[in-house]
Every structure is written in C-alpha cells, then in structure tokens.
C-alpha cells in the first residue's frame, strides 16, 4: 500500500519476530504503509502475556510503527484439567504443555472405566487440549457397575446375612418410611415410585445411606437428594403399574468396593431373566420374625411364569390387572423366600454371564399381606421395560 | 465505540459462589485481545484475576485459579466471572477490561457479608 | 510473580510542572508495561502501552519510557486535570501485576 509523502520519513525495517513473518515485504515503508506479522501454525501473537489474534502496524508521521512488535510463541495449551475419579499422565515430557505436546489420561483402576475417546489428548493450535476425536471437552471416568463380591447366582424373608461387598449398590432410604434403592452411576438412585411418593415435592427430606451392612450403624456415607423422579404413568392408590422413580443426588458418590452401581439391563438381559432364573433380593425388610432386619439381607429367588402370578393375584382381594405386563414376579410355590415390607424399592439383580455383571431385572414392589406365602409372589417393577425412561431423565438431568 | 458494562449481585454471603457478567457493546469478543477481570480492593490496590481470550482459551492469576472460572456467551457477546467459596477478603470493586486496558467499564461493587 | 513497586505512594506537584512517576518490576518484563489514570469513583483510563506507546486520544504531554525493570511516567506541563492517582501494570507474564498506585497531588 504505497503512498509517496516524500516529507515524511520512512519507518524501520520490520524485523519478522522468530516462527513469523512479515506482510507485505517492501523495500522500505512510509507514511500510512502497514505490515501484518503472520505467525507458524503451532504459534501465536503475543504481547506478553496478552493473546492478540492479529497483528498490524502502521507507519506514522515521525518514522515511527504504531504498535510495538509483538512475538510469536509457541502455543501453550497450559496444565490439564484434572479428572474426577481419574489421572493425567505427560506423555511428551514432564510438565510438556506446548503446541503437540501429548497427554494421557486414565481412570481409578476396578471401579472407573473411561467414556467418549480413549484419554489421549494433543496440544493443538488453536490452544485447546484435543482428543483425537477431536473433543475439547474431558473425557468421563464412568464408575464400573454391577462388581460384587458374589460371583454367582442361585444357589429377608427366608434370606442369608450379605457380607461386605456383596450388594454394592444397596441404598437405605429413611425420611417417612423405611424404604430402598439401588445406585446408578454416581449420583443417581433408582427405587420404587410408591416408596418416595410423599416425598416427591420435598427431595431433600431424604435420608439416603448407602456402603454399610447394618441399618443401625453409625458408619455409612450420607447422601442427600436434589430431586425426585416419579413415573408419570404412576397412580398413588390405585395399583402399582409403573412403580418406578429415580432420585438424582445432589453430589457424586466416590466409587469403592463397598459402593459400586449396579448395571441397567442390555437388551440381551431377557435372556437372563426367563421363568426359573434365579434373582437376588437384599434389603432390611422384615424378617420372618416380623422384625425390620438390623444387617442386609439377601434372597436368591426363581423367576415366576407371568401368566401364573398373573392368576394367583387375580383372586379377592386383589383386583383384577393387579399384574401388569410392566411387572416380574419371584418367589417360591411353597413360600418361605420373599421380600417384604421395608425391603420396597430395592433392587432385584440377576448375573449376565456374558459381561459377569450383575444387573437390576426388578424393583420390590408389592406382594401378598403376608410375606413368604405360599402360591403367593413377590412382585417386581420389570425395569427393562423402562430403559428409555431412565436413559432420557439421566442424559436431561 | 466500545464499551463494557459489568453487572452482579451487589451482596453475596461467605462461601456461596459470585457470578459477574461482562456485557460488551461495539466490538465482538471473539474479533481479538484478551478480556480480563480486575478487582480493585478499598484501599485502591488492584488486582488481576484473569482473561478469556478471543479464542476462548483463558489464563488465571495463580492465587485464585482453584476457585476461578472465566466462561462467555458469544452470542450476547458476554463474558462471566465465576469465583467459588467467597469470603469478606472478596469484597472489592470488579472491572472488566479488554487486552492490556485500553477500555475499562465502570466497574460494580461487591460486599461479601453475612 | 513479578512485583511492580511504585515507591512514592504520594507526588505533589503544580500546575505547568512537569512530574515523573516511576515503577520497578522484580524481573526483567520486557517493554510489557502499561500505565493508567484514575480518578476518585472513576474506572480506571489506560493512558500508555508497551512502555512507550500513547493510547489513542492521550495528550501528548502523556510520555512514557523504560525497559526491563525500570519505567517511568512522565506528565510535562501538568493540568488540574491530571490530578489523580496512576498505576503501572505489567502484562509480560502470568499473574499480570499492578504497581501499588502513586498519587499526584497539587502543592
């Protein structure tokens, strides 16, 4: 851009800054000529420690540039983010954070397994940490669900002691009435509709506990809830079809062996779920003693035919449709195995051989007046039924 | 012309988190420059908090940087302040200013009482 | 952290006089420092850049200079107006670091 003002003196040579250039090159520079300094991919602008995104000076009057030079250095992307549940490892060298530069990041071994793109990130130019997905974001330490110390299946009312570790993902619920849930993730529990109904306006009054054996015990990690979720196609008092609700909580659970949650159903979970599979109820429902139990206690129960707890609820005084499609039942012909009062909203979880994790099949729901009757059944809320429900309240939630 | 507006709370209680917006009218944060906020204390020392760049990359005084957190809206060509767990050594005056402080907006005050 | 010292707190001057303000950084920042106005209830006005470079719109009775740790704030014919109290800060590196204010004041 030449404008001859042979009046005016010319301006110093622009001396391109190291990693930059110089636009356009002249042979000499007068009054009103500019030149713009174009920086190596991988560096930037810089005036000190102030990003600028372009650069152009112009040549005055007095032979002098109006914008000092500014350097060109090279893109710092800065320390990462840290992880929840997880750790970053420096990959290019100790503390390395320029341009290229290559991260690692990883979760807490057994109890967290990463989500979205596998934790290696790259100093890029535009200086943001990039997966090579492309993602800006961090990468998610997911807690691993379904661990348990129980390897198998199969072999409460009628029910055994639970030892540590055996139902990781056994919550108390106390606030109103004495009730259970199961963790999801970190900080989500599911549970039955009807037991935290009265409290679905008032989250916070709920009490939760969970990483302990003993009701009682003094020794458990507390967490308080945000909000309720309460199926809208359930109807307090009238039936117990769509018996299921979600409790967000208000801050994330760290994962151990004695807190871990339990999976949701895959699609294939049918398979592990047909009449005679065996299922695992835990809670500190009431004993056959009529008691509520002072340590967990587990049930391991065959899947019911549909058709014949269908009918063995269709007597007085159960209305008709007591059993819906939305409902699983368990327990034995002859009785002696249940859950009961107390034990409501806690999970029925079956193994899936293939993963060897165990999963939620059913929520304690209802069942006869008189736990552990025979030709009469437990019955479940059949949360493969609801999977798309709870999938849509988590991502929104 | 450009201008930048600051606007908040005016009282917040110990430990509760502050939000600050910087609203800039006559030129778009993401154009260029850095866009900091400064806090001034009453006896007129003054401070720099950090910076949002034009690209979105931001930088933070260490002293705050585990409880700052500097975001933007591009389309209402705002940028915010966060700062977690406040205590009464946050009572201070907060601006917002573009690069090394060409244009500063008027500032808002902030009391941090219980 | 790069400190900025402004060792006078306090500069009386009159009107026509011409007052240097000086600043001294703790390391070495370059020409990255910057000056600024500020009058009571008022935000604060950038006046030079760069150590030497005027802001537009500045009197040109404004001057500044320096490198490296030592700067200085030159007002050659002081105006009423030019009472007020003036900041160095330094923008070479992170944290960016206010000097602690001198304040000019008429004798």
């Known amino acids: 851009h030449h404008h001859h003002h042979h009046a005016s003196q010319p301006c110093p040579y622009p001396m391109a800054p190291p990693n930059g250039h110089v636009s356009p090159v002249q042979a000499k520079y007068i009054l009103k000529d500019s030149f713009s300094i174009f920086c190596e991919t991988g560096y930037e602008l810089l005036q000190g420690h102030l990003p600028l995104k372009s650069f152009t000076a112009v040549c005055q009057k007095d032979g002098s540039w109006d914008r000092p030079m500014p350097a060109c250095s090279i893109v710092d992307c800065g320390p990462p983010d840290d992880l929840p549940s997880g750790r970053v490892e420096y990959i290019t060298g100790p503390g390395v954070t320029t341009y290229k530069a290559v991260i690692q990041y990883s979760c807490e071994e057994t109890f967290y397994t990463m989500k979205v793109n596998d934790g290696k990130y790259v100093c890029e130019a535009d200086g943001f940490w990039t997966s090579s997905k492309g993602e800006k974001s961090l990468p998610v330490c997911e807690p691993v669900c379904g661990l348990s110390a129980r390897t198998t299946g199969g072999r409460i009312y009628g029910g055994q002691k639970a030892k540590p570790g055996d139902f990781p993902w056994q919550v108390l619920i106390l606030g109103g009435t004495t009730a259970a849930g199961a963790l999801l993730y970190d900080n989500w529990v599911l549970t039955a509709a009807h037991a935290v109904y009265e409290q679905k306006h008032d989250a916070s009054a709920l009490d939760i506990r969970m990483g302990t054996l003993k009701r009682l015990s003094p020794h458990y990690t507390q967490a308080w809830s945000e909000a309720v979720f309460i199926h809208e196609g359930y109807t307090h008092d009238a039936g117990f079809d769509n018996d299921i609700a979600l409790i967000k909580l208000n801050n994330k659970v760290v994962i151990n062996s004695n807190i871990t949650p339990i999976c949701l159903p895959r699609k294939e979970a049918e398979s592990f779920m047909r009449t005679d599979d065996i299922g695992t109820a835990s809670g500190w429902g009431l004993t056959q003693r009529g008691f509520l139990a002072r340590n967990l206690m587990y049930v391991d129960i065959p899947i019911v035919d549909h058709q014949k707890c269908t009918a063995a609820y269709e007597k007085p005084p159960y209305p008709r449709g007591s059993v819906t499609a939305n409902m699983l039942c368990a327990g034995l012909e002859s009785g002696g195995k249940d859950s009961c009062r107390g034990d409501a909203g806690g999970a029925l979880v079956f193994l899936d051989s293939e993963t060897e994790r165990w999963f939620v099949g059913g929520i304690v729901s209802w069942g006869s007046m008189n736990c552990g009757e025979a030709g009469q059944y437990g019955v479940y809320t059949k949360v493969i039924n609801y999977i798309p429900w709870i999938e849509n309240i988590i991502s929104d939630f | 012309d450009v201008q930048l507006q600051e606007s908040g709370p005016g009282l917040v209680k110990p430990s509760q988190s502050l939000s600050l917006t910087c609203t800039v009218t006559?030129?778009?944060?993401?154009?260029?420059?850095?866009w900091n906020w400064i806090r001034q204390f009453s006896g007129d020392k003054l401070e720099w908090m950090g910076y949002i760049s034009y690209s979105g990359s931001t930088s933070y005084n260490p002293s705050l940087k585990s409880r700052i957190s500097i975001t933007r809206d591009t389309s209402k060509n705002q940028f915010f302040l966060h700062l977690s767990s406040v205590t009464t050594e946050d009572t201070a005056t907060y601006f917002c200013a573009r690069y090394w402080g060409d244009y500063w907006g008027h500032g808002t005050t902030l009391t941090v009482s219980s | 952290d790069s400190v900025m010292t402004q060792s006078q707190k306090f500069m009386s001057t009159s009107v026509g006089d011409r007052v240097s303000v000086t600043c001294k950084a703790s390391h070495n920042v370059g020409t990255n420092v910057a000056w600024f106005q500020q009058k009571p209830g008022q935000s604060p006005k950038g006046l030079i850049y760069s150590a030497s470079y005027r802001s537009s719109g500045v009197p040109d009775r404004f001057t500044g200079s320096g490198s490296g740790t030592d700067f200085t704030l030159t007002i050659s014919n002081v105006q009423s107006e030019d009472l007020a109290e003036y900041f160095c800060?330094?923008?070479?590196?992170?944290?960016?670091?206010f000097g602690g204010g001198t304040k000019l004041e008429v004798k």
């Open positions: 006559g030129y778009s944060i993401t154009s260029d420059y850095a």
């Open positions: 800060l330094q923008y070479n590196s992170n944290p960016l670091t």
